[in-house]
Interface confidence: low
């Protein structure tokens, strides 16, 4: 586009330019080719020699222009059509400009500290004759000249007549600029064009509100000499929380989000999340839902799983092994990373479940206690004659650190026998004498396993029919005992319990009870007995 600095045709009032001498250039009202009223300057002192008539415009601010165009529309009379003017008539005039920081006023054109610079000598492509004048065939010439680059704030134009018959119909002064625009979400300011012979003017754009430059490509455009924008380079992208809408970035509406400038559009909130505000850069998980630290913002919110289903167990007593298996939770929480974790509690045989304590490091878990993907586990090294509660918790990527102790678990409570890890027929009556009995039993923990050597056994016995309170007791570290000083031909009740030494000993029960009758004095020899 053209930025007009001066247009003489636009003035309805007198132009009031400075003419020296006073009998030279003269301001005259006229009409243009469309019969619109205009102000013109004319001079026609063609019969007098040595003409030097000057016309100086008012001060013209150059604005942002450095290369300025001067468009002159004028008529010029053909000297040959003027009788008696052959020696003095000229068919050209000169145009000058004078750069200044401020208006020179109406003084002589040469004043002001710097000399006028000549733009050009202007000749007519077409001049008119007396005959044309009579027929009103004024032949309008248009000439455009470029001046600059200018450095001061403004300038005056000056026209020198040296003896022509000329009428200045229009003086138009302008510079070309590329108009302010928005391209690729970047605003580019109105930019004055350089000369047609200069390089393009590179202009950096400014990203529109809520946008930012693309990686490595700050937005740029080039203003061409004709005032047209050329060669866009790079663009802006709407910031996180905003998306492109024509030439601007609009906030993501509630329910939508945009996490990065690299994503072009807002996305609907993933499942189980919401964005209540405009311009959300992420969506907040709904109550009881969460994302794991490794989930991207585009991931659906998920929740911890429900408890494992159908927890079943089997207890084998030789050796003492608890096997568990279960089914996946009914609700995985929307995630595929479900794992299982086991918690083992050893509880008192009676009373509330709260009287429990962790099983401790002695109990072994196969394949492991936590992070199981399998849906089965085995517990080893359980103590005989104890009651165990085992909880199996389902966990996933959004289960908190305390989730295993939370409520999403299934549990079973198991007693490791009716008081001991032996059935009645697992205790051997190895030797029965009139005054002694030898008993043996299998070890509750396999030989060689951790904890096997720590087991102690306590044997309690009393005469059948007597009060249990009148018992006698022996201890042994091996799974065998010989009790002596018994009465012949008497029925005794024997009870065995096993435990590792320590305060938990008292919690173990004496079970089962087996009865053995010593031999009478008359009995011959000793005899081995198979398990009865």
């Amino acid at each position: 586009e053209e930025v007009i600095l001066l247009d003489s045709k636009a003035s309805q009032a007198e132009l009031g330019w400075t003419a020296l001498p006073s009998n030279g250039w003269e301001e005259i009202s006229g009409v243009d080719e469309h019969d619109r009223p205009i102000r013109t300057y004319q001079v026609c002192n063609v019969l007098e020699p040595n003409q030097d008539n000057w016309l100086q415009t008012g001060w013209i601010s150059r604005g942002r222009g450095q290369r300025i165009f001067v468009e002159l529309q004028f008529t010029l009379r053909d000297c040959s059509s003027i009788p008696g003017a052959a020696g003095t008539c000229k068919e050209t005039f000169n145009v000058y400009y004078l750069e200044t920081e401020a208006d020179l006023g109406r003084g002589r054109p040469r004043l002001g500290g710097s000399r006028p610079r000549k733009i050009d000598t202007i000749a007519a492509d077409e001049s008119f004759t007396q005959g044309d004048l009579g027929e009103r065939k004024m032949k309008l010439n248009t000439e455009v000249r470029e001046i600059g680059p200018l450095s001061r704030r403004g300038f005056h134009l000056a026209f020198q007549d040296v003896g022509a018959c000329v009428a200045l119909v229009s003086v138009r002064v302008y510079y070309k600029q590329c108009r302010a625009t928005v391209r690729g979400l970047a605003t580019f300011p109105a930019t004055a064009a350089e000369s047609a012979f200069s390089t393009l003017v590179e202009v950096a754009g400014t990203c529109v509100a809520h946008s930012e430059g693309e990686p490595g490509s700050p937005p740029r455009m080039h203003c061409g000499a004709d005032g047209e924008w050329l060669v866009p380079v790079g663009r802006c992208s709407c910031s996180a929380g905003f998306q492109e809408r024509g030439d601007f970035c609009e906030a993501c509406p509630p329910g939508f989000y945009k996490v990065s400038p690299r994503r072009p559009l807002c996305s609907p909130c993933p499942e189980h999340s919401r964005a209540l505000e405009n311009a959300s850069t992420f969506c907040v998980c709904q109550d009881s839902y969460a994302r794991s630290p490794t989930d991207p913002p585009s991931a659906s919110c998920t929740r911890p799983p429900s408890a494992p289903r159908d927890l079943q167990y089997s207890l084998s007593r030789s050796p003492l092994v608890l096997r568990l298996r279960w089914l996946p939770p009914a609700d995985s929480g929307g995630r595929s990373d479900v794992t299982y974790s086991l918690l083992c509690l050893r509880c008192g045989r009676e009373g509330p479940a709260g009287a429990c304590e962790p099983c401790g490091p002695r109990v072994a878990f196969l394949p492991r206690q936590a992070g199981l993907r399998e849906r089965a586990a085995t517990l080893l090294h359980l103590r005989p004659g104890a009651r165990y509660t085992v909880r199996v918790a389902a966990l996933n990527g959004v289960s908190g650190p305390a989730a295993a102790a939370g409520t999403t678990y299934a549990q079973v409570t198991v007693s490791t026998g009716p008081g001991a890890p032996w059935e009645e027929d697992e205790i051997r009556r190895d030797r029965v004498e009139p005054q002694s009995v030898s008993l043996s039993w299998r070890e509750p923990i396999p030989a060689g396993a951790p904890g096997a050597n720590d087991t102690e056994y306590e044997i309690r016995y009393y005469e059948k029919g007597q009060s249990e309170q009148t018992y006698s007791m022996v201890k042994t570290g091996a799974p065998t005992v010989t009790v002596t000083n018994l009465k012949p031909a008497t029925r005794y009740v024997f009870q065995i319990r096993a435990a590792s030494p320590g305060p938990s000993w008292e919690a173990q029960s004496f079970n089962p009870s087996i009865e053995v009758q010593t031999l009478g004095e008359a009995a011959s020899g000793s005899r081995d007995q198979s398990p009865a």
Epitope: H210, G213, P215, P218, S239, P261, T281
Partner: antibody, heavy 112, light 106 residues
Framework: QVQLQQSGAELMKPGASVKISCKAT????????IEWVKQRPGHGLEWIGE????????NYKEKFKDKATFTANTSSTTAYMQLSSLTSEDSAVYYC?????WGQGTTLTVSS | QIVLTQSPAIMSASPGEKVTITCSAS?????MYWFQQKPGTSPKLWIY???NLASGVPARFSGSGSGTSYSLTISRMEAEDAATYYC?????????FGGGTKLEIK
């Protein structure tokens, strides 16, 4: 889940070249920019540049344009950074990153 | 390129104390990102888009700021917060990091 596994430590001689790899899993490899960051003790973190694997498009920080070259193999979902004409100034830990997921870092030592 | 200046470069704080780390940009940026790095590990995104906590970051952390001035604040310092914190801008390319603030526990 997103994981970036980088190649192991390298000991190189001055003037040599080295190629560091970054194996990406857990996301759509071709559509995310992979960035490379340099960390020297006492010098903090410095962005080297980035590559968009799907198109091969790259952006380099000016000072690394003649030092680093990024490539990517979409079939193996692996990004590479080659560093050439090595000097002691190139001794550093180099990280690959995508959005806010970072690799574990590759230590490069340049010594004669 | 935009230069990010962090202050202080090193500081120590007692448990329970309030901590503020600042990051000043040489030109205006839209958002600031903060990373935490502990010795021998990769940087971890800590705060993104100026004020949003990354997943798993304790609520005692917060971020704020606009234009050329940003900050990371810990309302009550804990031992696990001892680390080096870096700010990063991605508004203008190339992305740049601050020089880091080493936060120690007294």
């Amino acid at each position: 889940q997103v994981q970036l596994q980088q190649s192991g430590a390298e000991l190189m001689k001055p003037g040599a070249s080295v190629k560091i790899s970054c194996k990406a899993t857990g996301y759509t490899f071709s559509t995310y920019w992979i960035e490379w960051v340099k960390q020297r003790p006492g010098h903090g973190l410095e962005w080297i540049g980035e590559i968009l694997p799907g198109s091969g498009r790259t952006n380099y920080k000016e000072k690394f344009k003649d030092k680093a070259t990024f490539t990517a193999n979409t079939s193996s979902t692996t990004a590479y950074m080659q560093l050439s004409s090595l000097t002691s100034e190139d001794s550093a830990v180099y990280y690959c990153a995508i959005d806010w997921y970072w690799g574990q870092g590759t230590t490069l030592t340049v010594s004669s | 390129q935009i230069v990010l200046t962090q202050s202080p470069a090193i500081m120590s704080a007692s448990p329970g104390e309030k901590v503020t780390i600042t990051c000043s940009a040489s030109s205006s940026v839209s958002y600031m990102y903060w990373f935490q790095q502990k010795p021998g590990t990769s940087p971890k995104l800590w705060i993104y888009s100026t004020s949003n906590l990354a997943s798993g970051v304790p609520a005692r952390f917060s971020g704020s700021g606009s234009g050329t001035s940003y900050s990371l604040t810990i309302s009550r310092m804990e031992a696990e917060d001892a680390a080096t914190y870096y700010c990063q801008q991605r508004n203008s390319y190339p992305p740049t990091f601050g020089g880091g603030t080493k936060l120690e526990i007294k």
